[in-house]
C-alpha cells in the first residue's frame, strides 16, 4: 500500500530513508536538457524474496537533443550535493541498511539524473530526521516518522525532533543533550 503523502516537513531539518521497504518506487527523472530513453522505465521498484531485496528496472537518461543512450556513472560531487531528498549534510546511522530484511539500499545514481529524487513510499516506511547546519536538536528524542495505516488511510507520524538556532535556545535553561539514534519510537499508535 503506497503512502498518500510525503513524509512531514519540519522546521530546520531534513529527512532521509536509511533503507527502502519492498514496494517503494523511485521515479526515473532526468535533469534539464535530458529525458528518459524511449523504451526506458518510468520508475525503479524495490522488490525481493525472503532473503534478498534489490531495485528492479534501470533508469536511463539521454540528451533531449540527441538519440544517444547513456551508461550508468557516478555524478560529480556537485551534482550529488544537490540531491536533497537522498543526501544529507552529515551522516546518520540509526540503522544498518544491510541488516534490514525486506528493504533495499539507496539506489546508485545514474547519469544525468534529476537533482531531486522522488520516492513513492509504502506503509511501514521509516524516515529519519536531522537538524540542518546551524541548528541543533532541542532534545535527544526520536527523530523519525513512520508511514502508518489508520482508519483505512495512510498518514505519517509527527516527528518529535525540534531543531533550534543558538539564539532560540538561549532563553531555555536546562542541559542540552546530544541527539542520539532513536530508541523509543513514536510509532505504536493504536489502529482501529
Amino acid at each position: 500500500e503506497l503512502c498518500d503523502d510525503d513524509p512531514p516537513e519540519i522546521p530546520h531539518a531534513t529527512f532521509k530513508a536509511m533503507a527502502y521497504k519492498e514496494g517503494t518506487m523511485l521515479n526515473c527523472e532526468c535533469k534539464r536538457g535530458f529525458r528518459r530513453i524511449k523504451s526506458g522505465s518510468l520508475y525503479m521498484l524495490c522488490t525481493g524474496n525472503s532473503s534478498h531485496s534489490s531495485w528492479d528496472n534501470q533508469c536511463q537518461c539521454t540528451s533531449s537533443a540527441t538519440r544517444n543512450t547513456t551508461k550508468q556513472v557516478t555524478p560529480q560531487p556537485e551534482e550529488q550535493k544537490e540531491r536533497k531528498t537522498t543526501e544529507m549534510q552529515s551522516p546518520m546511522q540509526p540503522v544498518d541498511q544491510a541488516s534490514l530484511p525486506g528493504h533495499c539500499r539507496e539506489p546508485p545514481p545514474w547519469e544525468n539524473e534529476a537533482t531531486e529524487r522522488i520516492y513513492h513510499f509504502v506503509v511501514g516506511q521509516m524516515v529519519y530526521y536531522q537538524c540542518v547546519q546551524g541548528y541543533r536538536a532541542l532534545h535527544r528524542g526520536p527523530a523519525e516518522s513512520v508511514c502508518k495505516m489508520t482508519h483505512g488511510k495512510t498518514r505519517w507520524t509527527q516527528p518529535q525532533l525540534i531543531c533550534t538556532g543558538e539564539m532560540e535556545t538561549s532563553q531555555f535553561p536546562g542541559e542540552e543533550k546530544p541527539q542520539a539514534s532513536p530508541e523509543g519510537r513514536p510509532e505504536s499508535e493504536t489502529s482501529c
Epitope: 516537513e9 519540519i10 528524542g141 509527527q158 535556545t169 519510537r185 513514536p186 505504536s188 499508535e189
Partner: antibody, heavy 116, light 107 residues
C-alpha cells in the same frame, strides 16, 4: 484510539498549590512531546511549553517560566501541570495536547478557578 | 517570539457563504502553520497543518493556503456546524505562538 484525559475542574484560593493531570492512551505516550496550552476566560490560546515524558525534559515559554512546573510519570502515561502558589490571574482553562508542532489530539481541558 | 495577527477578529456570515480568514506572521514562517477550530466549551480541533495539508477526517470544504508570512483559511461553503472561533498557530520558530482568533458568527 488516541486519547488524552485530563483531571476535573478545580476551585482554589490564592496562595494555594495545585497539580492537574493529563493521562494519555492509545499511543506511545513516553515518546511524544506533551504541550500545555492556557485559555483565559473569553480569550485566545497561549502556548505554555512542552514536556517529553520519556525523560521529563521540559521547555517553557518565557511568559510561563518560573510560574508553573511540568512533570510526567511515563509508567502511568501521565503528564502534570502544577502551581506552588496560585494567583487570581491563573484562572483559566488548561489543555494538554500531543505535539510537538501542531496539536493533533487534545485533552478535554481542566478549568482552574482561583478566587478568594 | 513571532507575533501572529488574524483578521478579521469577528466575521458575520450566512450558511453557504465562502469565508476567508487571514493570518499574518511578524516574520517569514516557511509554511509551518496550523489552523484550529474551537467551539464554546470544547477543546480546539486541528483542521490544517503545514499551511495547506488537511487533517484526516476534516471536511474538504476547509482549505489552507499561503506562504512566507501571509496565510488564509477558506471555508468554501459555510455549514451550520462551522460557526466557531478559528486560530492559526506558527511552529517555525521556537516557541510556537497562536493568533488571537477569529470568531465566525451567524449574520
Amino acid at each position: 484510539e488516541v486519547q488524552l484525559v485530563q483531571s476535573g475542574a478545580e476551585v482554589k484560593k490564592p496562595g494555594e498549590s495545585l497539580k492537574i493531570s493529563c493521562k494519555g492512551s492509545g499511543y506511545s505516550f513516553a515518546n511524544y512531546w506533551i504541550v500545555w496550552v492556557r485559555q483565559m476566560p473569553g480569550k485566545g490560546l497561549e502556548w505554555m511549553g512542552i514536556i517529553y515524558p520519556d525523560d521529563s525534559e521540559t521547555r517553557y515559554s518565557p511568559s510561563f517560566q518560573g510560574q508553573v512546573t511540568f512533570s510526567a510519570d511515563k509508567s502511568i502515561s501521565t503528564a502534570y501541570l502544577q502551581w506552588s502558589s496560585l494567583k487570581a490571574s491563573d484562572t483559566a482553562m488548561y489543555y494538554c495536547t500531543r505535539g510537538p508542532y501542531y496539536s493533533d489530539y487534545w485533552g478535554q481541558g481542566t478549568l482552574v478557578t482561583v478566587s478568594s | 517570539d513571532i507575533q501572529m495577527t488574524q483578521s478579521p477578529s469577528t466575521l458575520s456570515a450566512s450558511v453557504g457563504d465562502r469565508v476567508t480568514i487571514t493570518c499574518r506572521a511578524s516574520q517569514i514562517i516557511s509554511g509551518y502553520l496550523a489552523w484550529y477550530q474551537q467551539k464554546p466549551g470544547k477543546a480546539p480541533k486541528l483542521l490544517i497543518y503545514k499551511a495547506s495539508s488537511l487533517e484526516s477526517g476534516v471536511p474538504s470544504r476547509f482549505s489552507g493556503s499561503g506562504s512566507g508570512a501571509e496565510f488564509t483559511l477558506t471555508i468554501s461553503s459555510l455549514q451550520p456546524d462551522d460557526f466557531a472561533t478559528y486560530y492559526c498557530q506558527q511552529y517555525n520558530s521556537y516557541t510556537w505562538t497562536f493568533g488571537q482568533g477569529t470568531k465566525v458568527e451567524i449574520k
